[in-house]
């Protein structure tokens, strides 16, 4: 069976939107009005992995781009990157480990934990216009909570 996907945007808990910053990086900033069109639309795919009521394994691709968020070790540190893939083969039900995030729903907010690096989360900074990154702390200065807005296909 083909993998199930939906289109969505994400905003952090301070209502910052995610936009492209160069070819392989996302940044978070406040947008309004027509600028909202700059925000990236994700194709969220529901993939194979350990699942529970509040934890669902997903992959986050950029809609109509052959780019996926992935988590790899760089200089011994878990790192978030945008990775290009062959569009003929993706998305797929069995994604490589580095592409899988556990989508965790808590109090109507979403967290995205790396399946490869437990307790590391997609994060944004308090500051404006800073890169989206993989953070190893929750509840500190950095933001790990998001809301999801559905986008029609």
């Amino acid at each position: 069976a083909p993998v199930r996907s939906l289109n969505c945007t994400l905003r952090d808990s301070q209502q910052k939107s995610l936009v492209m910053s160069g070819p392989y990086e996302l940044k978070a900033l406040h947008l309004q009005g027509q600028d909202m069109e700059q925000q990236v639309v994700f194709s969220m795919s529901f993939v194979q992995g350990e699942e529970s009521n509040d934890k669902i394994p997903v992959a986050l691709g950029l809609k109509e781009k052959n780019l996926y968020l992935s988590c790899v070790l760089k200089d011994d540190k878990p790192t978030l990157q945008l990775e290009s893939v062959d569009p003929k083969n993706y998305p797929k039900k069995k994604m490589e480990k580095r592409f899988v995030f556990n989508k965790i729903e808590i109090n109507n907010k979403l967290e995205f934990e790396s399946a490869q690096f437990p307790n590391w989360y997609i994060s944004t900074s308090q500051a404006e216009n800073m890169p989206v990154f993989l953070g190893g702390t929750k509840g500190g200065q950095d933001i790990t909570d998001f809301t999801m807005q559905f986008v029609s296909s």
Partner: antibody, heavy 120, light 107 residues
Framework: EVQLVESGGGSVQPGGSLRLSCAFS??????????VGWIRQAPGKGLEWVSH???????SYNPSLKGRFTISKDTSRNTVYLQMNSLRAEDTASYFC????????????WGQGTTVTVSS | DIQMTQSPSTLSASVGDRVTITCRAS??????LSWYQQKPGKAPKLLIY???KLHSGVPSRFSGSGSGAEFTLTISSLQPEDFATYFC?????????FGQGTKLEIK
Amino acid sequence: EVQLVESGGGSVQPGGSLRLSCAFSGFSLSTSGMGVGWIRQAPGKGLEWVSHIWWDGDESYNPSLKGRFTISKDTSRNTVYLQMNSLRAEDTASYFCARNRYDPPWFVDWGQGTTVTVSS
Amino acid sequence: DIQMTQSPSTLSASVGDRVTITCRASQDISNYLSWYQQKPGKAPKLLIYYTSKLHSGVPSRFSGSGSGAEFTLTISSLQPEDFATYFCLQGKMLPWTFGQGTKLEIK
């Protein structure tokens, strides 16, 4: 020091089954990011990745196996298994287990291999 | 599946020579490539990972380079213990696939 030791190889007729074991020491398969894979090598041929299991139980298989093999782990016994069913002559090979950490993989430590012969 | 093609299949060289082995992928594999050395009757040994990072304990005469779909393993000055078979492995996409091997033999 990391060690991996394969066992369970032998001769079997086509259609038969075998269970290979990979007993390891020097690391734990409950450590996040840790994985163990099986790689085989037919006599005089190259290497072929067979299957892999991560610390969290996530499994992967080479689709060429058509669902005949199953990987599993017993974390408390520090052992990974490869259950091989419906064996064919082309499964004849040395089977190595090897350790990796994180994806993308590279296999850091290898066992010495166990030989599987499928013949009537 | 991603096909990995090594060249040459066999390479004859002498002690002290500089040798290069090439591995080509059927599609872009980023830098997700590792190299292994195998001697007859033995298990493979990791030499290089992430295209160019030397595994601990591996002599510095071994080096790796490349990106995208073309990669090389270079031995700067062959030693007697380097005569063996070398394999590349791509980790970009499941199923992970090896090159067919390059046998390095004494000239």
